[in-house]
Interface confidence: low
């Protein structure tokens, strides 16, 4: 309710005013309907529909009738209120879509335009594959795509729902950062629930971050309103934007947004493959045509930049494919489930002492051979999802298999009396699933002409939009500069972050007798004088830097102490604080052989005479803790010689690993690294530990780690990462690549069990690779989690490296 609004005021001359009138005055802006604060005559004056949205031959030169939705009178151009096809029908002009593609090398704007305006045309539920329908169904959109810059698809954020994604587009933030973590969500501090329908969504307290329209306003750039009340017809939205574009210079906004509820509405109803989808797509295209014809009519079609963008895709889902938690849990009435294409579970009762998320997870884990969802504590979700660090995200999360739904119990799912489902499509699944991918097209003077770019994530668009408007972006999750290749000219030139801690290159050799590791192998070395040789090897730098650090030394972006340790087959940045490497890098050629490890080396390690005993791990800690074992960052199996193998067993190559996780890590090192090297003509691998106990996606400080691992001398990583780089052109070996690079990265959860993989009792070949693909990640994710900066020394431009760092290898089939 809006008790303060005096609706007796009038919208005469105020329709779609850009300044929102404050109480007690009634409003005439495009959101007044949502807030129920419009003046009494808003519908009558501002939502006129008489005679439709188009000129017909018989309307040309009509006597102006103010009741008409738009005009075809001789004065309409001067008045800025023509129907968008006025010049086509009445003056013999061509439709924009019928004109040839033309390269707009520089914006051709009327006098008074300080910068090319930006129009963001957002469409709900536009699955990337809809673009395949082409110009027969969507001639206008197809022209934008082929004449402008497009990607095969754009990745939404998880969950692939409307509100989280629209607000991510506006802020460049992940939902965990901006707060809109779902279309519906409960905030335990507010003790309130946010729903798509309902008034709570109008409360500013839910919306974090800085959206583009605020960034613009703060920097003196006018923004048209980004939201439209659902009752305002699409045609009226377009005509309004066109009218705003004719405002005097000092009133005219520089950025505008259009939003269409289609094709999402139809996608839900008919499913993404329903033949009925053609009509809504035609309708959207018609609106795009009206926009472009309208811009041409205003002589702005070679001035403005247009972004055509979706929020998420659409999957074929019906209620017959529903998993019921009542088949797994006895107490579903004690929980609240946010149901559907993902599941979020919380206790129905606040402060319920009996509520045990771990017990619920146990009852939901691997219980059926054909289970269509996987339960996670939110901190164990794949890090690429960035879906944990917010109190509105419940502790228990269910990742649902594509094409399926999850519900509490059968009573919670409804069908028509005929038994048919009420929907055929839905979205919300894992954001790497190809049906969830959506569309991106950029068209106009600032975008490149006829250019196809690789897929990217929607968190990156906020920075691009700021660039288009000459704004300095607020802090966000995008990587500024990573999309420079979309733009004809770049106002922003990214620079490499400064290295904060330079490494130490150890010059001291500690006496062998100083070490008591509790597990040394050195007594197994024959002959005895070989030991000195092995230790001397540790001090000869040789050419390992060039061979194993193909892209320069990773930079450490926080204050710490670490040593560079050279070896024949690998190189490490060894932390004196964590007593393990921050990173270990090695290059594996296509021809590399996997060798076995001698029995006498399998259960012992060697002291590293370059590192003080007080900065070395001690095996006694592992002997006393049966739950913990250790593994190696450089795989002993890939040693180039028997002598080099001893380097792999140095205590400085050792990291704490749960026995269950070692199965994953060993299979990765023994089988998959070799497989990748064979397939890709050699690979460079950088691996290391991650500490993210507070699951905020950022590197934990030493103090933070101490809070979580009290009483342990060796901090246990929460994850291990691996970055695998090769030449994009597999005909070139990884270490002699002069073209673009190809990267795939993983952030593997370091857990004491393998219950995430239901078939982990089987041979590793049956499940490890699937697990790794699930935990695929961007290099950028790893950089945030480690405070390291990779790829600092290459022949490629820095924006190209940023594009590489923001790439996610999805292991999905083509869109």
């Amino acid at each position: 309710d809006s008790p303060w609004t005096n609706i007796s005021g009038s919208c005469k001359g105020r329709c779609f005013e850009l300044q929102e009138a404050g109480p007690p005055d009634c409003r005439c802006d495009n959101l007044c309907k949502s807030y129920t604060s419009c003046c009494h005559d808003f519908d009558e004056l501002c939502l006129k529909t008489a005679r439709g949205w188009e000129c017909t031959k018989d309307r040309c030169g009509e006597v102006r009738n103010e009741e008409n939705a738009c005009h075809c009178s001789e004065d309409c151009l001067a008045r800025g209120d023509c129907c968008t096809n006025y010049q086509v029908v009445c003056k013999g002009e061509s439709h924009w879509v019928d004109d040839d593609c033309e390269e707009i090398k520089a914006a051709e704007c009327p006098a008074g335009f300080v910068r090319p305006p930006l129009i963001i045309f957002s469409v709900d539920g536009f699955r990337a594959s809809y673009m395949k329908k082409g110009s027969k169904v969507m001639p206008n959109i197809e022209k934008l795509r082929s004449c402008g810059t497009h990607s095969p698809y754009m990745r939404p954020v998880y969950p692939t729902k409307t509100f989280p994604n629209l607000y991510t587009l506006a802020t460049g933030l992940y939902p965990e950062s901006h707060g809109i973590v779902g279309n519906s969500m409960y905030d335990p501090v507010f003790d309130a629930t946010f729903h798509l329908r309902g008034r709570e969504k109008f409360n500013h307290r839910w919306w974090g971050g800085q959206p583009l329209w605020i960034t613009a306003t703060k920097q003196g750039v006018k923004a048209g309103t980004f939201f439209w009340s659902v009752v305002i017809p699409h045609e009226r939205r377009i005509l309004t934007i066109l009218q705003w574009l004719t405002l005097p210079d000092h009133e005219r906004p520089s950025v505008y947004a259009f939003y269409s509820e289609q094709p999402d509405f139809s996608g839900h109803k008919y499913g993404p493959f329903g033949p009925e989808m053609t009509n809504p797509l035609r309708e959207i295209d018609k609106i795009v045509g009206q926009l472009m014809d309208g811009l041409k009519q205003l002589k702005l079609h070679r001035c403005v930049n247009v972004i055509f963008v979706g929020d998420h895709g659409m999957e074929d889902v019906t209620c017959d494919r529903t998993e019921f938690l009542s088949n797994y849990l006895t107490n579903v009435d004690d929980i609240t489930l946010v149901p559907g294409t993902l599941g979020r579970i919380r206790s129905k009762f606040s402060n319920n002492a009996k509520y045990d998320p771990k017990a619920i997870i146990a009852n939901l884990t691997c219980k059926k051979p054909d289970q269509h969802f996987k339960p996670y504590l939110k901190q164990h979700l794949p890090k690429r999802l960035h879906y944990a660090n917010n109190r509105r995200i419940e502790d228990i999360h269910l990742l649902v298999e594509r094409r399926w739904h999850v519900a509490r119990k059968p009573l919670d799912v409804y069908k028509k009396p005929s038994g048919k489902c009420f929907f055929q499509g839905d979205h919300g699944f894992d954001n790497k699933v190809n049906s969830m991918q959506t569309v991106f097209v950029g068209y106009g003077s600032t975008f490149k002409y006829k250019t196809k770019v690789p897929p990217f994530e929607n968190i990156e668009l906020y920075n691009v939009m700021c660039d288009l408007l000459g704004l300095k972006p607020a802090p966000n999750n995008g990587t500024h500069g990573s999309l420079n290749h979309l733009l004809r000219t770049n106002t922003f030139r990214p620079t490499m972050p400064e290295e904060v801690t330079r490494p130490n290159y150890p010059g001291i050799m500690y006496l062998q007798s100083d070490f008591d590791l509790g597990c040394t192998c050195d007594d197994k070395v024959e002959p005895k004088n070989k030991l000195d040789e092995l230790n001397k090897r540790l001090h000869t730098k040789g050419s390992t830097e060039e061979r194993h650090l193909l892209y320069g030394r990773p930079a450490v972006l926080y204050r710490t102490r670490y040593d560079i340790l050279y070896h024949t087959d690998f190189e490490s940045g060894y932390s004196e604080i964590f007593l393990m490497p921050l990173w270990t890098s090695y290059t594996v050629s296509k021809q590399a052989e996997v060798s076995s490890v001698p029995d006498h080396l399998t259960s012992c390690v060697r002291p590293d005479v370059r590192v003080s005993p007080s900065f070395s791990q001690n095996c006694l800690a592992y002997k006393n803790d049966k739950q913990m074992s250790y593994g190696f960052l450089f795989p002993p199996y890939l040693s180039s010689s028997p002598e080099a193998k001893y380097d792999a067993f140095l205590v400085t190559n050792m990291v704490p690993m749960y026995p269950a996780f070692k199965r994953v890590w060993n299979y990765f090192q023994r089988v998959l690294v070799k497989k990748y090297a064979s397939e890709r003509n050699g690979v460079n691998v950088i691996s290391g530990p991650i500490f993210d106990y507070d699951y905020d996606g950022l590197h934990d400080t030493e103090d933070k780690i101490k809070q979580y691992v009290e009483g342990s001398s060796i901090p246990v990583p929460t994850h291990y990462y691996s970055i695998i780089t090769s030449c994009l052109d597999f005909t070139q070996p990884a270490d002699k690549c002069d073209g673009p690079l190809s990267v795939s990265s993983f952030i593997l959860p370091h857990r004491p069990d393998n219950e995430e993989s239901c078939n982990s009792s089987e041979d590793e070949s049956k499940w490890v690779e699937e697990l790794m693909k699930m935990h695929t990640a961007r290099v950028r994710d790893i950089e945030h989690l480690t405070s390291l900066d990779f790829f600092r020394k290459t022949s490629r431009s820095y924006p190209e490296i940023l594009t590489l760092k923001t790439y996610l290898h999805t292991y999905e089939s083509e869109i």
Epitope: D1, S2, K33, S34, T36, H195, R197, G198, R199, S229, V230, V231, F265, H268, K269, D333, I335, T336, L337, V338, P339, K348, A407, R408, K409, P410, L411, D412, V413, Y414, K415, K416, P417, G419, F422, F423
Partner: antibody
Framework: QVQLVQSGAEVKKPGSSVKVSCKAS????????ISWVRQAPGQGLEWMGG????????NYAQKFQGRVTITADESTSTAYMELSSLRSEDTAVYYC????????????????WGQGTLVTVSS | DIQMTQSPSSLSASVGDRVTITCRAS??????LNWYQQKPGKAPKLLIY???SLQSGVPSRFSGSGSGTDFTLTISSLQPEDFATYYC?????????FGQGTKVEIK
Amino acid sequence: QVQLVQSGAEVKKPGSSVKVSCKASGGTFSSYAISWVRQAPGQGLEWMGGIIPIFGTANYAQKFQGRVTITADESTSTAYMELSSLRSEDTAVYYCARIARYARGYMHTFDYWGQGTLVTVSS
Amino acid sequence: DIQMTQSPSSLSASVGDRVTITCRASQSISSYLNWYQQKPGKAPKLLIYAASSLQSGVPSRFSGSGSGTDFTLTISSLQPEDFATYYCQQHLSIPITFGQGTKVEIK
């Protein structure tokens, strides 16, 4: 054909509780959602609450919160509404009604109604 | 809560008359509005859902219109069996609320 058959009339003392049942037939009960609506003598309709899937739980009007409990027993295709701490102003006809579901989700459109149960609260 | 206000509270009409009942919501409810008919001693019956869609089995003389805050139920030609009380109901948000009812009586 969907039918909702409610339990018979009840006379209750103030402070006591009443439990009204609503048995469904025709169609699968597991695909039903049920709301309860009451009507005091000579008055209009008043929504009390219902089992609403989109919220994953029973939902109640603020006015009845703490006094009303709505449950369902799939094995007998029966929904129940229990109202406690009865007072004279609770005298009304209590209806169960099926919540319809459409393409975009669960809409509180009541397409089938029970015959009603008169509950009289009198000392 | 969203308040629903019907007008008039009652009206007298003759068989064959065109009858219009209006319902106003205290805030915009888009098209989330239903109309019900109730005869004495009987349960309500759904006539119109989503503001303007006719429920199957309901005679075509009943029609609904409106969107946002103002809605109308029209009976194009009143029949003897149409004398009853009519209720509007919003289902945009919980709690669900009904109008106070409009009683259509014989003149």
